[in-house]
Interface confidence: low
């Protein structure tokens, strides 16, 4: 297992609709054809997997149908979007990239993106 540098923004503010997007960029030491991207959430020293996708270079990322993540890839960059976020989901979102094929296997883990989510104020009742 060899180390690989992964860069991601330090802070991202989710939209009022609970959507946050950020770029995860990795320094590929070789010509990987199969890449796995995993988003981990760290909160209170607990790390949980948010979503993961394996893709062939040049193809779209495919997350599970019920995943809250979507994404696109371009070269060594992955554009990740997480949807359905609420204030309680505020935390550090870590991008992990694995170059699965061909060997040797490379693993890179970013420093994390702090995603802040603010629940929108409920609209006041209207008379009309």
């Amino acid at each position: 297992c060899k180390a690989m540098h992964v860069a991601q923004p330090a802070v991202v503010l989710a939209s009022s609709r609970g959507i946050a997007s950020f770029v995860c960029e990795y320094a590929s030491p070789g010509k990987a054809t199969e890449v796995r991207v995993t988003v981990l959430r760290q909160a209170d020293s607990q790390v949980t997997e948010v979503c993961a996708a394996t893709y062939m270079m040049g193809n779209e990322l495919t997350f599970l149908d019920d995943s809250i993540c979507t994404g696109t890839s371009s070269g060594n960059q992955v554009n990740l979007t997480i949807q359905g976020l609420r204030a309680m989901d505020t935390g550090l979102y870590i991008c992990k990239v694995e170059l699965m094929y061909p060997p040797p296997y490379y693993l890179g883990i970013g420093n994390g993106t702090q995603i802040y989510v603010i629940d929108p104020e409920p609209c006041p009742d209207s008379d009309f």
């Epitope: 297992c1 062939m56 699965m100 060997p103 040797p104």
Partner: antibody, heavy 124, light 107 residues
Framework: QLQLQESGPGLVKPSETLSLTCTVS??????????WGWIRQPPGKGLEWIGS???????YYNPSLKSRVTISVDTSKNQFSLELSSVAAADTAVYYC????????????????WGQGTLVTVSS | DIQMTQSPSSLSASVGDRVTITCRAS??????LGWYQQKPGKAPKRLIY???SLQSGVPSRFSGSGSGTEFTLTISSLQPEDFATYYC?????????FGQGTKVEIK
């Protein structure tokens, strides 16, 4: 509970091709978290890793066997298979299939589930 | 290829004994090492992964340690069901290789 079951002929003639299938039950072979592998053990000897496959079809082979080995996967049947061509008496062994897991804590792989093994004898 | 050398090849011990098996790698493998137990006619059983992490369901008398090139498997108090052959395996680089095995016999 995940289970792996090897199947195939127990006797193969020299110079022919050994073909084995591993059927996975209790879990999906298409999970992106795992590899699937073959290991063999000649009678009274140690273990030898033959090769591994990812559900996408990407393969990793032991160079000592690479010219004779083909590992394939059939996600629709939840199976993966081993073919070893031009067999000789030295290929007589118990053949195991296994799941390869990935430990996120350290980035290590490990074999966590094994089939019970099937003895393949190469003899005329 | 990375060569894995286990020592001793075999040992005799009594129930209750503390047993230590060593595995050496021909080059550094970080902590990418697993330990397996095998009984006659059975498939290997997972014991330790990542050099020192105990597989769930494995008794706590088993422990693993080491990093780099030297690793040990320790059985703190040998039980009757522990008499078996133990293998180490490196999963750091291809081809993944096993040690030759250590047979633990009853004294």
């Amino acid at each position: 509970q995940l289970q792996l079951q090897e199947s195939g002929p127990g006797l193969v003639k020299p110079s022919e091709t050994l073909s084995l299938t591993c059927t996975v039950s209790g879990g999906s072979i298409s999970s992106s978290s795992y590899y699937w592998g073959w290991i063999r053990q000649p009678p009274g000897k140690g273990l030898e890793w033959i090769g591994s496959i990812y559900y996408s079809g990407s393969t990793y082979y032991n160079p000592s066997l690479k010219s004779r080995v083909t590992i394939s996967v059939d996600t629709s049947k939840n199976q993966f298979s081993l073919e070893l061509s031009s067999v000789a008496a030295a290929d007589t062994a118990v053949y195991y299939c296994a799941r390869v897991s990935y430990y996120y804590g350290s980035g290590s792989y490990y074999f966590d589930y094994w089939g019970q093994g099937t003895l393949v004898t190469v003899s005329s | 290829d990375i060569q894995m050398t286990q020592s001793p090849s075999s040992l005799s011990a009594s129930v209750g004994d503390r047993v230590t098996i060593t595995c050496r790698a021909s080059q550094g493998i970080r902590n990418d090492l697993g330990w397996y137990q095998q009984k006659p006619g059975k498939a290997p059983k997972r014991l330790i992964y990542a050099a020192s992490s105990l597989q769930s369901g494995v008794p706590s008398r088993f422990s693993g340690s080491g990093s780099g090139t030297e690793f040990t498997l320790t059985i703190s108090s040998l039980q009757p069901e522990d008499f078996a052959t133990y293998y180490c395996q490196q999963l750091n680089s291809y081809p993944w290789t096993f040690g030759q095995g250590t047979k633990v016999e009853i004294k």
